[in-house]
Each structure stands twice: as structure tokens, then as C-alpha cells.
């Protein structure tokens, strides 16, 4: 996949990285769907939000997510084997004050209500893919990506960069 640095190389860089600005470089609303064109939807149930992966009925409106993009600078180390340069990180908010969070203990993706500054669990490194899809890598757990498992979003460990094109971690963004 394009833009993918080897997963292992990111390990130190992600933990060392810092968001260079408190304000995003850009933001926009988009619907999120899987590689197989299933929609990511959000439903309020018992005062908490649930995230679903489902086929929408014809003419059914897609849920929109506010994507906020941040630059993250990470240093190269003296020995020359460190990752240098800038990464593009994203937060995803389907409704006011709620953000997608990585729950690394449960290997789950959850919606949490929180105030800014957002915790690291709400930041995902954005990767562009060959198919013009994107993937979202946990800032807090390098090599772990948002993926689809049993019609839900889950955290999926990707062992090598060859596996970064697996369909279950690929998503499409659409403004329509």
C-alpha cells in the first residue's frame, strides 16, 4: 500500500510523535464505508453509541463523520534507523463531542464522549492505499488498525506491510 512505512518501523515513531498543532490542518464531513461498500453507521442505544457495519437499503441516508486531520512530527534518531518526517493523523467524530477511540485492551473501537485535547486513543495514522482506499492505524498501538470483524469495527493486528492491503482494514471516504 502507498505511504505505508514498515509496521515495525512505526513502533518507536508513533510513540515518540507529537501532534504539531492543536488545530487540524483541514476538516470535512464524509461517509465511511468498507472496501466492500458496506456503510459504517452509528446508533444511539441506552444513552451510548453503537457502531455497525451494514448494507444500507436503497436511498437510505449514509451517516457522516467529521474527519479532522492533524500533522504529527516524529524525529529521526542519531543512528539513522529512526523514522523521520511527518505523518498525517485523523480523528473521527460522528456526532458532537463523541470520537472514535481505540480500546487496545478489548481490541475494540468505541465511541467516547470527551473534551479537547483529545487523548491519544482518538488519533489514527492515516494511510493511503493503492485502491484509493484508506486505513487507520492506532497511534497508541502501532501495527494495529481499525478493521471489520463480524459486522462491527474492531482493532486488527497487522503483522507486516504486505498485509496492509487486506480488505478488512480498507475503507472508502465519500462526501456524498
Amino acid at each position: 500500500a502507498f505511504g505505508i512505512s514498515g509496521v515495525q518501523k512505526y513502533t518507536r515513531a508513533l510513540h515518540d510523535s507529537s501532534i504539531t498543532g492543536i488545530s487540524p490542518i483541514t476538516e470535512y464531513l464524509a461517509s465511511l464505508s468498507t472496501y466492500n461498500d458496506q456503510s459504517i453507521t452509528f446508533a444511539l442505544e441506552d444513552e451510548s453509541y453503537e457502531i455497525y457495519v451494514e448494507d444500507l437499503k436503497k436511498d437510505e441516508k449514509k451517516d457522516k463523520v467529521l474527519l479532522s486531520y492533524y500533522e504529527s512530527q516524529h524525529p529521526s534518531n542519531e543512528s539513522g534507523d529512526g523514522v523521520d518526517g511527518k505523518m498525517l493523523m485523523v480523528t473521527l467524530s460522528p456526532t458532537k463531542d463523541f470520537w472514535l477511540h481505540a480500546n487496545n485492551k478489548e481490541h475494540s473501537v468505541e465511541l467516547h464522549k470527551c473534551e479537547k485535547p483529545l487523548p491519544d486513543q482518538a488519533f489514527f495514522v492515516l494511510h493511503n492505499m493503492h485502491s484509493n482506499c484508506v486505513s487507520f492505524e492506532c497511534k497508541t498501538d502501532p501495527g494495529v488498525f481499525i478493521g471489520v470483524k463480524d459486522n462491527h469495527l474492531a482493532l486488527i493486528k497487522v503483522d507486516s506491510s504486505e498485509n496492509l492491503c487486506t480488505e478488512n482494514i480498507l475503507f472508502k471516504l465519500s462526501e456524498t
Epitope: G3, S5, M87, L88, N128
Partner: antibody
């Protein structure tokens, strides 16, 4: 300081081939996707090809698909473009470029080489 | 493929002038647009990325705006070193495409 230096250009006959190189320094080459862009004399910029950081995924503009091959050697910090079945319309300055973000192409290309001229003529 | 158009194709201006160049995409590219400056015989130089973000080291007289399909590059007070050709590029999806360029020359 980021540096990209292209080489390998020259005069070639139609139908001939050539290999361009781009030597990278001043950054961790193996963490970046890299790109080739060309510019015909007196014309605008044209995207040619992209390769991801470890070389296992490539993409080509329709105009060069099946004729050009992009590759890289991370141990040598070098990007390549093999040009084949060359046509007069391939005559251009070829630039290698690094994308702004390690993980994403959304930021465009922040570093460019000085370019190498490929002349296709009989 | 996404087509990019630019206007005007050329503009004659004087030092101190405000210059505005527009770029239009054939379909929505959100904010993923870059602007480059190129001088004769030189490589392009990134000025603006993500539509409105100034690349490090670029003077603040350059600014970018827009989203979706319509974008603008503005040079607030043209300096002698700004006479060049300017290109927009969509960085939203492969294959990346460039606008045809706008040449800014001396009036």
C-alpha cells in the same frame, strides 16, 4: 537536508529503453512512497508513477502503463524508472519526488530532484 | 481520472500587485490540493498543501483557499522572485493530476 538527484537521461531512439535513477539522501528513504513526474519541453507537469515505501505496490499513469517500470532499492537509497518502448511523446525532463507525509499522499510532493532529460529521436 | 483546470493561463503583473490564480477539479477532492511554483530550468517547489497550509519556508504573502472543486492561490504583494509558473495538483486520488499551469510574468 533532503536531496534527490536524478541520473540516466540521454538520447535514445524510438522503441529503445533507458533506466533512470534517483539517489536520495538526508531522510529515511525506506519510510516514504516515491513518485516520478515528467515535463515535456515547454509543457506542463505530468504524473508518471508511484511506488510505496517497501516496493511491493506500484501505480502507473495510463500513458506509460506496460512500458515503464518503477522500482527501488532501499539498501542503496535509490529509486528507479525503467523506460521501455520509448515514443517521441515520452521526451521530457523526468523528476523524482518525495511525498510530504510518510503515511499519506494527501499532502502532495514536498521534495523534488533537479530532473534528468530524456530525448527520444531517430 | 480527475481533470484539473487553471485560470488564467497567464497573467502580467507588476511588483506589489495582488495576484489570484484559480484551480478547478472535475470532481470533489475535499481539501487535498497542492500548489507548486516552477521557474525556468528548475524543479517545482511546493508552496501550499491541503489547500491552505503553507509549506515550511514559503513566504506568508502566498496563501491558498477553497475546498471541494474550487481553489485559489493568492500572492498578496508580488515580489520580483515570484515571476514563475504556478501549478495546482490534486492529491486526493490516483492518478495524481496537475493543472496546465499559470504563467505570471512582468507587465
Amino acid at each position: 537536508e533532503v536531496q534527490l538527484v536524478e541520473s540516466g537521461g540521454g538520447l535514445v531512439q524510438p522503441g529503445g529503453s533507458l533506466r533512470l535513477s534517483c539517489a536520495a539522501s538526508g531522510f529515511t528513504f525506506s519510510t516514504y512512497s516515491m513518485h516520478w513526474v515528467r515535463q515535456a519541453p515547454g509543457k506542463g507537469l505530468e504524473y508518471v508513477s508511484t511506488i510505496n515505501n517497501n516496493g511491493d505496490t506500484t501505480y502507473y499513469a495510463d500513458s506509460v502503463k506496460g512500458r515503464f517500470t518503477i522500482s527501488r532499492d532501499n539498501s542503496k537509497n535509490t529509486l528507479y524508472l525503467q523506460l521501455g518502448s520509448l515514443r517521441p511523446e515520452d521526451m521530457a525532463v523526468y523528476y523524482c519526488a518525495r511525498q510530504t507525509y510518510t503515511s499519506s499522499w494527501y499532502g502532495g510532493f514536498d521534495s523534488w530532484g533537479q530532473g534528468t532529460l530524456v530525448t527520444v529521436s531517430s | 481520472d480527475i481533470q484539473m483546470t487553471q485560470s488564467p493561463s497567464s497573467v502580467s503583473a507588476s511588483v506589489g500587485d495582488r495576484v489570484t490564480i484559480t484551480c478547478r477539479a472535475s470532481q470533489g477532492i475535499t481539501s487535498w490540493l497542492a500548489w507548486y511554483q516552477q521557474k525556468p530550468g528548475k524543479a517545482p517547489k511546493l508552496l501550499i498543501y491541503a489547500a491552505s497550509n503553507l509549506q515550511s519556508g514559503v513566504p506568508s504573502r502566498f496563501s491558498g483557499s477553497g475546498s471541494g472543486t474550487d481553489f485559489t492561490l493568492t500572492i498578496t504583494s508580488l515580489q520580483p522572485e515570484d515571476f514563475a509558473t504556478y501549478y495546482c495538483q490534486q492529491a486526493n486520488s490516483l492518478p495524481f493530476t496537475f493543472g496546465p499551469g499559470t504563467k505570471v510574468d512582468i507587465k
